[in-house]
């Protein structure tokens, strides 16, 4: 059996439903069978899990994933496979397999596989803060989503009116979430904020720097 | 040699009911899927039913889907199609085929013509 | 469905000559592909599987080639016998659906 899955990695919002594509060509036989299992993203294909089957006429979703499977068409020998998984959990990121066989059509190993990322919207990132804060000092502000998919970009933004930093003295990551202030002045202080995004939205969070002559550093 | 002989056509009113039956020989019936297709006079082929090697799963395009049925019976190496509710569309030669590993048809019958008129 | 569309209807040929008679699938039927011959008051014979597999007893001057939505049926060199009415069939998805069918006539 040859088995056709889409060569694009699949991408479902968190808590829809995701339409796992899955079709083949066969004259289906009574001895027909169709597994669906699951791997977690990094493990090897060996790892798998089932969860759904359709053996003898029937339909047998298992696992943890059990209430939320089913076939876009049953039974699946029309020529569809397709699986649903509804209301989509980020557990349900990782590759999943769809396994038709039909003896005696042994031509391919009738498997196809699948990647699927369930997309989800920045958590509120926690903002903190490390380093000198004294003038001259130099300080980094940290910025960190624990949610998201996929990985938030950070972008940091000082807050109201106030010179323009000289060039080199702030300096940010936007993959790493951290923003490196150098040579700092007193009007370095300030509120700083922080906006994790991705494609599902954004979060923020923010942050009081305050800098000190050398005798005293600390943050509000 | 494979053959495939259809038998069953005949003349039939609007409304009506037809059996077809197809008697195979010179393969392993009980191991290929089998269909019906059919041919309306000077038109082109349409496939009208299917069904696994057990008989298992049965499958029908919309425009038959309720109306006929297909069937088998592996130990008399026969194929069998029951018409009921026919119209004057469903006028046709009917042919057998026997399926491929994949669904194209390798053998055919001859074909029983059916007339649907009043 | 999967609609599948056969050029020309007709074609008019001689023999020797070569013929190359399209078919158009409406999706992406990869390479899952049957043609036919129909000789009058015949039953259909199976050319060509899978877009190019020739069956056991079918003459090499019969050759299918394409995948996804276009596929071709090429006879090298017509002969007396080719003179038929030839249909596609995707055998991908059910339901099975066959092109219109094209006739190849004597010029």
């Known amino acids: 059996v040859e088995v056709k899955v889409p060569t694009e990695p699949l991408s479902t919002p968190l808590g829809k439903t995701a339409e796992l594509t899955c079709t083949y060509s066969t004259s289906v036989g009574d001895s027909f069978a169709l597994e669906w299992s699951f791997v977690q993203p990094g493990k090897p294909i060996s790892e798998s899990h089932p969860i759904l089957y359709f053996t003898n006429g029937h339909l047998y979703p298992t696992g943890s994933k059990s209430k939320r499977v089913s076939l876009l068409q049953n039974p699946p020998t029309v020529g569809v496979a397709t699986l649903k998984l509804t209301d989509v959990h980020p557990s349900d990121t990782g590759t999943y397999l769809c396994q038709v066989n039909n003896p005696p059509d042994f031509y391919t190993n009738g498997l196809g596989l699948i990647n699927l990322t369930v997309l989800v919207p920045p958590s509120n990132p926690l903002c903190s803060q490390s380093g000198q804060t004294s003038v001259g000092g130099s300080t980094a502000l940290r910025c960190s989503s624990s949610e998201g998919a996929p990985k938030p970009v950070y972008n940091w933004v000082r807050l109201g009116t106030f010179p323009t930093p000289s060039p080199g003295s702030m300096v940010q990551d936007e993959v790493s979430g951290q923003l490196i202030l150098t040579n700092l002045s007193l009007t370095s202080s300030g509120t700083y904020r922080c906006v994790a995004t991705n494609q599902m939205g954004s979060a923020s969070c923010e942050l009081t720097l305050s800098v000190t002559e050398p005798s005293q550093g600390r943050v509000a | 040699q494979v053959q495939l002989v259809e038998s069953g056509g005949g003349l039939v009113k609007p409304g009506g009911s037809l059996r077809l039956s197809c008697a195979a020989s010179?393969?392993?019936?009980?191991?290929?899927?089998m269909s019906w297709i059919r041919q309306a006079p000077g038109k082109g082929l349409e496939w009208v039913s299917s069904?696994?090697?057990?008989?298992?799963?049965?499958h029908y395009p919309d425009s038959v889907k309720g109306r006929f049925t297909i069937s088998r019976d592996n130990a008399k190496n026969s194929l069998y199609l029951q018409m009921n509710s026919l119209r004057a569309e469903d006028t046709a030669v009917y042919y057998c085929a026997r399926q491929g590993v994949r669904p194209f048809f390798d053998y055919w019958g001859q074909g029983t013509l059916v007339t649907v008129s009043s | 469905d999967i609609q599948m569309t056969q050029s020309p209807s007709t074609l008019s040929a001689s023999v020797g000559d070569r013929v190359t008679i399209t078919c158009r699938a409406s999706e992406n039927i990869y390479s899952y592909l049957a043609w036919y011959q129909q000789k009058p008051g015949k039953s259909p014979k199976l050319l060509v599987f899978n877009a190019e597999t020739l069956p056991e007893g079918v003459p090499s001057r019969f050759s299918g080639s394409g995948s996804g939505t276009e596929f071709t049926l090429t006879i090298s060199s017509l002969q007396p016998d080719d003179f038929a009415t030839y249909y596609c069939?995707?055998?991908?998805?059910?339901?099975?659906?066959f092109g219109q069918g094209t006739k190849v006539e004597i010029k």
């Open positions: 069939q995707h055998h991908y998805v059910i339901p099975w659906t």
């Open positions: 010179g393969f392993t019936f009980s191991n290929s899927g």
């Open positions: 069904i696994s090697d057990g008989g298992l799963y049965t």
